[in-house]
Interface confidence: medium
């Protein structure tokens, strides 16, 4: 599956635990592998063009989201969301995807 | 079409019980989020309490904790709010709405509402 | 808990004014803040989710805006349907938290 797929149903995923059912052990469960994959590094074009384009700000994301778990401040976690909403608005905007 | 529709409301007195009900149609209800929100007469609007209906996971409005119970039978499409040790100041209109999220977005909100149902807590 | 300041209160305003009404949070709340409009006797109805996206159906003089924690509804010409009170709504956490309304009268 292409890395934009999956990082789209994952943030999806992700928000329905968090938002839904305020879970926040489920949320890192869907978060962490993708950002493994991510740290993995890029082994096609398509890999590569994501990278390039989103995987500065979901590494800030998830630094924000890491603090959260040392801090306990819930306003950590409100950074990760303010930029996980912004890539999953450009990855849904580029790539077509219907809800 | 989606439809949330209360009832159960009326007149209890104070310490009394009542058990709400939000029968819901047209939508997934197992994988829904359904809300309470209440309104006192001539007052704005109050969070109350929510459930995921997969899961069953809950949430509460301190005002209520301890006194309300939200449930959901998904073999009925009916969310629930038990009130039990009801005092004067939950006289209010109570409402349920489904919660949900959108394309393009991540963020959720209310976006079907029921017609309401009147509580009055009076001795 | 979040506060959700909305202001003002009331206001009153005429068919085709622009009407712009502000909510502020407490602290970071992200986008995640939605506008409802409910009529007397009724229930309240959702008009923007996720701070600016228009929710489907709504008329288009509608629109949202986000500035830090600082959240507009604005109403870019008035009509006569659309006398009512908004609220805003955050989701982020809970509880979660609604202004304490705007109520839009006819001048």
């Known amino acids: 599956i292409l890395w934009h797929e999956q990082w789209h149903e994952g943030l999806e995923e992700a928000s329905r635990l968090y938002f839904g059912d305020r879970n926040v052990k489920g949320m890192f469960e869907i978060l962490e592998p993708l950002h493994a994959m991510l740290e993995r590094g890029p082994q096609t074009l398509k890999e590569t063009s994501f990278s390039q384009a989103y995987g500065r700000e979901l590494t800030e994301a998830y630094e924000w989201s890491q603090r959260y778990k040392t801090s306990a401040v819930v306003m950590d976690l409100d950074r990760a969301w303010d930029i996980y909403y912004h890539v999953f608005q450009k990855i849904s905007r580029h790539h077509h995807h219907h809800h | 079409e989606v439809q949330l529709v209360e009832s159960g409301g009326g007149l209890v007195q104070p310490g009394g019980s009542l058990r709400l009900s939000c029968a819901a149609s047209g939508f997934n209800f197992y994988s829904s989020y359904i809300h309470w929100v209440r309104q006192a007469p001539g007052k704005g609007l109050e969070w109350v309490a929510s459930i995921s209906s997969s899961s069953g996971s809950t949430s509460y409005a301190d005002s209520v904790k301890g006194r309300f119970t939200i449930s959901a039978d998904t073999s009925k499409n009916t969310a629930y709010l038990q009130m039990n040790s009801l005092r004067a100041e939950d006289t209010a209109v109570y409402y349920c709405?489904?919660?949900?999220?959108?394309?393009?977005?991540?963020?959720?909100?209310?976006?079907?509402w029921g017609q309401g149902t009147l509580v009055t807590v009076s001795s | 808990d979040i506060q959700m300041t909305q202001s003002p209160s009331s206001l009153s305003a005429s068919v085709g004014d622009r009407v712009t009404i502000t909510c502020r949070a407490s602290?970071?709340?992200?986008?995640?803040v939605a506008w409802y409009q409910q009529k007397p006797g009724k229930a309240p109805k959702l008009l923007i989710y996720s701070a600016s996206s228009l929710y489907s159906g709504v008329p288009s003089r509608f629109s949202g805006s986000r500035s830090g924690t600082d959240f507009t509804l604005t109403i870019s010409s008035l009509q006569p349907e659309d006398f009512a009170t908004y609220y805003c709504?955050?989701?982020?956490?809970?509880?979660?938290?609604f202004g304490q309304g705007t109520k839009v009268e006819i001048k």
């Open positions: 602290q970071s709340v992200s986008s995640a």
């Open positions: 709405a489904r919660f949900s999220s959108y394309y393009y977005t991540l963020y959720w909100a209310m976006d079907y």
């Open positions: 709504q955050q989701s982020i956490h809970y509880p979660l938290t």
